[in-house]
Interface confidence: medium
């Protein structure tokens, strides 16, 4: 807490500009309005004060703002974001995407803070749900963001928002986010045609039931490897040695290689050895 | 990975000025701070000062006010610092360092160094 | 301006020790304080922001510690890789400064 002390004669500031880096912090306190600050935030960033200064310039804006910041003060705190703490944020209403882009800029290139983690949530909760343009702007500067959300919470995710997930997104998905994703990308993706329906839905496949992998291998989709063997092992498991060859297409011969994992490992457990032989790659059940 | 490449070695006479460059790779240039720190033989690091890229605005220690001049280009992602009215005093290396308001306001990135002697 | 006093110019040193390097500032900086390695013939390299935070990649047998006008910088097990002048920083106010360094040697 900065203690309360007169402003010098002559050092009332009588706007935000560079000669405020200068002054000691508790001249900031005394000689800076808060409501000059508030409705000049702009200027803050402008203005490389360091980060104890930056302390004083939130007291400022906490003693005016004791139940929140206005979203016009929230969108230009700029570098005075990372002073927020998640109690701090949670007093706010944040309604704009602009405001979320202008603070998930601040922490750019850095893992998501519990600032930042409260800020989405708050954003999110406030939308009511995960459209698309909020998922582009999270998945842009967080790419593992969804795959950061309970099952719970993804259940918030209108199918029309699958479009804007990219492979990337989902790479730290745990099969149970994936069982909750697939099957809004199934119906995001319904209308499009074979090749192109295969294209999108791959990245959610970890979450396809066995029915849905039969149904993709009657359709000459040549599933690589890497995506096979990230399906669930309890939807592997019942297909077929035809069913698993026609999914696989040329890339069947990759099934040697991982013969000893999951899911690979326990399939061919299940089938009978004269179907493995038909593969032709010496597959032991 | 972040890199500053600053310009090479200067030798200049007493009286001439010298301008060097850093030039930043690997994050976006705009997004940070650029200081420039003096390490002369047996004195300490010497802060010169600081420019905000994206606004061009700079401040200095008032020590190297009317000495050194701060400016930027943005579009080649290269911080300039003039050394004005030399003399053997200015003889240092000088080093731009990246402030990144993340980690406090310390220096979290430094170009290698550029070494400038100042004789007749 | 805030002057930051690092008191010895100089320690001798050995593989394995446990290091303390101090430095006072004239007047409180709160926890606003770096500390940088520079090795010679290279620039400095962050260790340590805001009095105790470790930067990303410096090994865990580097901390800082203190507040107010006095810190430390110690090096838990010291290794000869450490061997290079230690500079603390004050970021609390105008001008920035930094300790004149000190610099570790081996015994």
């Known amino acids: 807490e900065v203690e309360k002390t007169a402003c010098p004669s002559g050092k009332k500031a009588p706007e935000i500009d560079e000669s405020l880096i200068f002054y000691k912090k508790w001249e900031l306190e005394a000689c800076v309005d808060a409501a000059l600050l508030a409705t000049q935030m702009d200027r803050v960033n402008a203005i490389p004060f360091t980060y104890e200064q930056l302390d004083v310039l939130k007291h400022k804006l906490d003693e005016l703002y004791p139940q929140g910041y206005p979203e016009s003060v929230i969108q230009h705190l700029g570098y005075l974001f990372l002073k927020m703490s998640p109690e701090d944020i949670r007093k706010w209403n944040v309604t704009s995407l602009e405001t979320l882009k202008a603070l998930l800029e601040v922490n750019k290139g850095h893992e998501m803070s519990p600032q930042v983690a409260t800020l989405i949530d708050r954003f999110v909760k406030g939308r009511g749900q995960l459209d698309k343009d909020t998922l582009d702007t999270l998945t842009a500067f967080y790419p593992g963001y969804l795959c950061s959300l309970s099952p719970e919470e993804l259940s918030s995710v209108p199918p029309s928002s699958i479009w804007a997930v990219r492979p990337q997104d989902l790479d730290t998905c745990d099969p149970r986010q994936l069982d909750v994703l697939y099957p809004k990308a199934r119906l995001a993706f319904q209308n499009m045609n074979g090749s192109e329906y295969f294209v999108k839905i791959q990245s959610f496949l970890g979450g396809a039931p066995t029915e849905d992998l039969k149904a993709l291998s009657q359709q000459n989709v040549s599933m690589d490897l890497a995506t096979f063997m990230k399906l669930r092992t309890d939807a592997v498991l019942p297909l077929t040695v035809a069913e698993v060859q026609k999914l696989l297409g040329p890339h069947v011969e990759g099934l040697k290689a991982e013969e000893r994992h999951r899911p690979v490992r326990d399939w061919i457990l299940r089938q009978r050895q004269d179907d493995l032989d038909t593969l032709g790659l010496g597959l032991q059940g | 990975e972040f890199q500053l490449q600053q310009s090479g070695p200067e030798l200049v006479k007493p009286g001439a000025s010298v301008k060097i460059s850093c030039k930043a790779s690997g994050y976006s240039f705009t997004d940070y701070n650029m200081n420039w720190v003096k390490l002369s033989n047996g004195k300490s690091l010497e802060w010169i000062g600081v420019?905000?890229?994206?606004?061009?605005?700079?401040s200095y220690n008032q020590k190297f006010k009317g000495k050194a001049t701060l400016t930027v280009d943005q579009s080649s992602s290269t911080a300039y610092m003039q050394l004005n009215s030399l003399t053997s005093e200015d003889s240092a290396v000088y080093y731009c360092?990246?402030?990144?308001?993340?980690?406090?306001?310390?220096?979290?990135?430094w170009g290698q160094g550029t070494t400038l002697t100042v004789s007749s | 301006d805030i002057v930051m006093t690092q008191s010895q110019k100089f320690m001798s040193t050995t593989v394995g020790d446990r290091v303390s390097i101090t430095c006072k500032a004239s007047?409180?900086?709160?926890?606003?304080v770096a500390w940088y390695q520079q090795k010679p013939g290279q620039s400095p390299k962050l260790l340590i922001y805001s009095a105790s935070n470790r930067y990303t990649g410096v090994p865990d047998r580097f901390t800082g510690s203190g507040s107010g006008t006095d810190f430390i910088l110690t090096i838990s097990n010291m290794q000869s890789e450490d061997l290079a002048d230690y500079f603390c920083?004050?970021?609390?106010?105008?001008?920035?400064?930094f300790g004149a360094g000190t610099k570790l040697e081996l015994k």
């Open positions: 007047q409180n900086v709160g926890t606003a």
């Open positions: 420019i905000i890229p994206n606004y061009g605005t700079s």
């Open positions: 920083q004050q970021y609390s106010s105008y001008p920035l400064t």
């Open positions: 360092a990246r402030w990144d308001n993340y980690y406090g306001s310390s220096l979290d990135y």
